[in-house]
Amino acid sequence: FGISGKHFITVTTFTSAGNIGEDGTLSCTFEPDIKLNGIVIQWLKEGIKGLVHEFKEGKDDLSQQHEMFRGRTAVFADQVVVGNASLRLKNVQLTDAGTYTCYIRTSKGKGNANLEYKTGAFSMPEINV
């Protein structure tokens, strides 16, 4: 199956919206490697230096995380095994809107996909019976 980094892997994202002040999810999936220690997940945001979130070797590595995301991000660690690289974003802010990249590296190769994240004061429509 080739040397690490020489193959492109398929990464899929879904455009989503976040409600200001609530928690949101940026969705990203991939075909998971059975070698979980070889999986690296990085979330980046256009226009921001540093990372939104990094997960590697089975745990978070927030050493390069941008300060605007400090304490507000998490991946679903127990779901990486089934290819879920989605990012949980706590206390969504208006400034969280923008273009995000979900970058995945495995023993087979690497891949990425972008998503547009919209933020606002969305509410469920009232239904009158």
Partner: antibody, heavy 116, light 107 residues
Framework: EVQLLESGGGLVQPGGSLRLSCAAS????????MHWVRQAPGKGLEWVAS????????YYADSVKGRFTISRDNSKNTLYLQMNSLRAEDTAVYYC?????????WGQGTTVTVSS | DIQMTQSPSSLSASVGDRVTITCRAS??????LNWYQQKPGKAPKLLIY???NLQSGVPSRFSGSGSGTDFTLTISSLQPEDFATYYC?????????FGQGTKLEIK
């Protein structure tokens, strides 16, 4: 009901071949990685091989590498284990298991006996 | 390869007892550890995944803890149906490896 059903086991002479099948039902088979795990009589569990959801990643235990081949047919919801050059030490109950957060669904097992 | 060592290998206990089984990995596996229960002639059953998460349908008397190299399975109050063999398993990397098993017997 989520179910895995193995078949294809039996008695085979050393050096012989067998193909095990694992039929999946009750879940979206193409979304999950799968494993083969075996258990020799009176012994513990031993991982044999794994395959990811779209067959992009395949791994084998050293003890079977070069002799066994794991594969899957997502259109038939079936996992396979082709076993060649069988040895007495391959005698075991062979289980297929779904790869989720843990091996969360197991088949009932199929017995492979390698003996002359 | 990552070696998984369980202790004890066998254990005698009574209904109602609190039982602890430990599992040690030869190197760090983060929280990528599962616990299984197996009864004679049956397939293993997943109890705990990712070190501490209770699998759906498993009684709450089972719990798991630990990360890195040291892990624990605890049964808070043994029931008659809990007498079985228990295995830990790491899924951090290949080869996937199991502990040798802990046989839990009635005292």
């Amino acid at each position: 009901e989520v179910q895995l059903l193995e078949s294809g086991g039996g008695l085979v002479q050393p050096g012989g071949s067998l193909r095990l099948s694992c039929a999946a039902s009750g879940f979206t088979f193409s979304s999950y990685g799968m494993h083969w795990v075996r258990q020799a009589p009176g012994k513990g569990l031993e991982w044999v091989a794994s395959i990811s959801s779209s067959s992009g990643y395949i791994y084998y235990a050293d003890s079977v590498k070069g002799r066994f081949t794991i594969s899957r047919d997502n259109s038939k919801n079936t996992l396979y284990l082709q076993m060649n050059s069988l040895r007495a030490e391959d005698t075991a109950v062979y289980y297929c298991a779904r790869a989720s957060s843990g091996m969360d669904v197991w088949g009932q097992g199929t017995t492979v006996t390698v003996s002359s | 390869d990552i070696q998984m060592t369980q202790s004890p290998s066998s254990l005698s206990a009574s209904v109602g007892d609190r039982v602890t089984i430990t599992c040690r990995a030869s190197q760090s596996i983060s929280s990528y550890l599962n616990w299984y229960q197996q009864k004679p002639g049956k397939a293993p059953k997943l109890l705990i995944y990712a070190a501490s998460n209770l699998q759906s349908g498993v009684p709450s008397r089972f719990s798991g803890s630990g990360s890195g190299t040291d892990f624990t399975l605890t049964i808070s109050s043994l029931q008659p149906e809990d007498f079985a063999t228990y295995y830990c398993q790491q899924y951090y990397t290949t080869p996937l490896t199991f502990g040798q098993g802990t046989k839990l017997e009635i005292k």
